[in-house]
């Protein structure tokens, strides 16, 4: 099943996707669409690139903020709403016969927590959530530590997220 990423309403969501251009600089078409990857292309395309640049965006909220020319085609959705929830497809159209790379990721948008932050949680976010967090500006902040989501409630998650001081924070759950 898809990897899940959680973002709060009004924040930026970051959905990672990348490939290694071979040779470097030899870019390939990529599409992002809402809905699982179909047999060709993307359904409900939100952003599309060609061999040179982004050439189609259905909204100004969709951005490739990574180093697109090095194959970082991670999608940033700015100012997310509940309607942005769902499965997204990143399709990398590697030239050749049935060479496409397809990546399905699930975005879960939740309402902001209306709770008092817990003052005791001052730990580093990546150690609190091994393999679970991505940030909109810095890409995946992952360790190789196996395991499931730590036994922490959403209030604590939001507290830790706020400590990032990064409006693009997206929490990833396996």
């Amino acid at each position: 099943s898809e990897v899940e990423y959680i973002a709060e309403v009004g924040q930026n969501a970051y959905l990672p996707c990348s490939y290694t251009p071979a040779p470097p600089g030899n870019l390939v078409p990529v599409c992002w669409g809402k809905g699982a990857c179909p047999v060709f292309d993307c359904s409900n395309v939100v952003l599309r690139t060609d061999n040179r640049d982004v050439n189609d965006r259905t909204s100004g909220r969709y951005w490739l903020k990574g180093d697109f020319h090095k194959g970082d085609v991670s999608l940033t959705i700015e100012n997310v709403t509940l309607a942005d929830s769902g499965v997204y497809c990143c399709r990398i159209q590697i030239p050749g016969i049935m060479n496409d790379e397809k990546h399905n990721v699930k975005l879960v948008v939740i309402k902001p927590a209306k709770v008092t932050p817990a003052p005791t949680l001052q730990r580093d976010l990546t150690s609190a959530f091994p393999r679970m967090l991505t940030t909109g500006e810095h890409g995946p902040a992952e360790t190789q530590t196996p395991g499931s989501l730590p036994d922490v409630n959403l209030t604590q998650i939001f507290t830790l997220t706020n400590e990032l001081r990064d409006s693009g924070a997206t929490i990833r759950t396996a």
Epitope: P29, G35, V39, F40, D41, C42, D50, Q93, D100
Partner: antibody
């Protein structure tokens, strides 16, 4: 109005070759994947091949892989299917279809390919 | 590859009656399921895509439903021009596959 017009069908001997063309109009051709689908006489539909809008990515059914080659010329708004090593079982009406992602939303009227000695 | 099984093979009905056609997939197709109508000597015509969305120009008497592996095409009240062969098609996984078709004939 979307229009797709196939041509190039005909009678060919087993082992022979044929090249089908599909002229497209009424939409931005280079923005869409295109497919070939065939239908043997009195039978159902069988997807044959597809190509991405840019032409870089291609897809084939196992039954034609290595024998058929799909291509496109976006400057001419034309889709092609080069068919080599034809067999009797390739006899069918061949349709080209616009394939935005999963459904085939517009079809041509088809061209008949008959493989017989 | 994903196998699509349509039932029944033939449906004998009168104009004005309701037609219910079934399509079952051997595994989930992520709701990328389409329905086509084909009349003798003509190309197939897209009726329904993504399981439940009517294609441009398709009358409201045609509706699609279902998800995952089980899908249904319903024609609420058959018109004389609706008697034809209907195919389902999945586009969730390569290769594209079609069902074997259901013929809706006049009773």
């Amino acid at each position: 109005e979307v229009q797709l017009l196939e041509s190039g069908g005909g009678l060919v001997q087993p082992g022979g070759s044929l090249r089908l063309s599909c002229a497209a109009s009424g939409f931005t051709f280079s923005s869409y994947a295109m497919s070939w689908v065939r239908q043997a006489p009195g039978k159902g539909l069988e997807w044959v091949s597809a190509i991405s809008g840019s032409g870089g990515s291609t897809y084939y059914a196992d039954s034609v892989k290595g024998r058929f080659t799909i291509s496109r010329d976006n400057s001419k708004n034309t889709l092609y299917l080069q068919m080599n090593s034809l067999r009797a079982e390739d006899t069918a009406v061949y349709y080209c279809a616009k394939s935005p992602y999963a459904p085939l939303d517009y079809w041509g009227q088809g061209t008949l390919v008959t493989v017989s000695s | 590859e994903i196998v699509l099984t349509q039932s029944p093979a033939t449906l004998s009905l009168s104009p004005g009656e309701r037609a219910t056609l079934s399509c079952r997939a051997s595994q989930s197709v992520n709701d990328y399921l389409a329905w086509y109508q084909q009349k003798p000597g003509q190309a197939p015509r897209l009726l329904i895509y993504d399981a439940s969305n009517r294609a441009t120009g398709i009358p409201a008497r045609f509706s699609g439903s279902g998800s995952g592996t089980d899908f249904t095409l319903t024609i609420s009240s058959l018109e004389p021009e609706d008697f034809a062969v209907y195919y389902c098609q999945q586009g969730g996984h390569a290769p594209i596959t079609f069902g074997q078709g259901t013929k809706v004939e006049i009773k």
